[in-house]
């Protein structure tokens, strides 16, 4: 986490720090939304539990051609120990059910402004 | 339009039960945190515990754990309280109460109220 | 648990005058997001409470301008500049940072 906030970083971000920037970037992007975001393009849903952030990046790695949620990508690989490649598939995704990206965005959203709320940033 | 009805106050003898509901409209519970909070006669205000709807994650005040049970229906769109053992101590009006949708920093909208007396 | 204290318990003003309300908490209510979860909620008689100011000085959307809250770390305050008739009523402070969240015991203001 102390990665987070971009190369241009003076110094490590705090985790409370990261976290909101990151709801600030999707609650952006829903916020910006026009068109269907992403073309409509489907992910995997995933379970919003530990190890979510990696869930996520591995859905969303999986949509390429998307400039929207590029930033939203680069955000979450900081929060992923491990390093995401297109294909990868974590246990925590719900393997039968896909969802719109946008669907995917809000679902994510609502439980990380919840988390920053109760104080869990990592 | 926000609103949030409580119902299933009333009177209830010493050691009874009571369960108290909280209907929402205009908006999803599962967006935010439902609280529940009591006044007793002439007394301040007392925050019992919160649910999210989302998740069942569910915190109380210590005093009332055990006693009081929170909880949600999403597909109802209300949250409830169950009250076991009641005391005459907990007479009191019970309020709902929902966190903005925002960053959950407030309770933005309230319900009317439903009166609790518990006496024999 | 944390404690609010509110002070006064009760107080007699007349329209027009300054009205000051302080509420002190028993630790820090900053949370570890670093937001201060401190509110200021009035109540009428047989009504709900109604919220005026949030995060310590944030004043809610329709609130008048006479409203304003101050404070940081443990001590807190509600000002209301010029008492109006409307304003005869009872505050709670209150603490959402730290569960179980607390209110003050409230400040009845009474018209003098």
């Known amino acids: 986490l102390t990665c987070l906030g971009g190369f241009a970083s003076p110094g490590p971000v705090p985790p409370s720090t990261a976290l909101r920037e990151l709801i600030e970037e999707l609650v952006n992007i829903t916020q910006n939304q026009k068109a269907p975001l992403c073309n409509g393009s489907m992910v995997w849903s995933i379970n919003l539990t530990a190890g979510m952030y990696c869930a996520a990046l591995e859905s969303l790695i999986n949509v390429s051609g998307c400039s929207a949620i590029e930033k939203t990508q680069r955000m979450l690989s900081g929060f992923c120990p491990h390093k995401v490649s297109a294909g990868q598939f974590s246990s925590l995704h719900v393997r039968d059910t896909k969802i719109e990206v946008a669907q995917f965005v809000k679902d994510l959203l609502l439980h990380l402004k919840k988390l920053f709320r109760e104080g869990q940033f990592n | 339009e926000v609103q949030l009805v409580e119902s299933g106050g009333g009177l209830v003898q010493p050691g009874g039960s009571l369960r108290l509901s909280c209907a929402a409209s205009g908006f999803n519970i599962k967006d935010t945190y439902i609280h529940w909070v009591r006044q007793a006669p002439g007394k301040g205000l007392e925050w019992v515990g919160r649910i999210d709807p989302a998740n069942d994650n569910i915190k109380y005040d210590p005093k009332f754990q055990g006693r009081f049970t929170i909880s949600a229906d999403n597909a109802k769109n209300s949250a409830y309280l169950q009250m076991n053992s009641l005391r005459a101590e907990d007479t009191a009006v019970y309020y709902c109460?929902?966190?903005?949708?925002?960053?959950?920093?407030?309770?933005?909208?309230w319900g009317q109220g439903t009166l609790v007396t518990v006496s024999s | 648990d944390i404690q609010m204290t509110q002070s006064p318990s009760s107080l007699s003003a007349s329209v027009g005058d300054r009205v000051t309300i302080t509420c002190r908490s028993s630790?820090?209510?900053?949370?570890?997001?670093?937001?201060?979860?401190l509110e200021w909620y009035q109540q009428k008689p047989g009504k709900a409470p109604k919220l005026l100011i949030y995060k310590v000085s944030n004043r809610f959307s329709g609130v008048p301008s006479r409203f304003s809250g101050s404070g940081s770390g443990t001590d807190f305050t509600l000002t209301i500049s010029s008492l109006q008739p409307e304003d005869f009523a009872t505050y709670y402070c209150f603490q959402g940072s730290h569960i179980p969240y607390t209110f003050g015991g409230g400040t009845k203001v009474e018209i003098k």
């Open positions: 630790q820090s209510i900053v949370h570890s997001n670093g937001n201060t979860y």
């Open positions: 109460a929902r966190s903005e949708e925002n960053w959950y920093d407030f309770f933005d909208y």
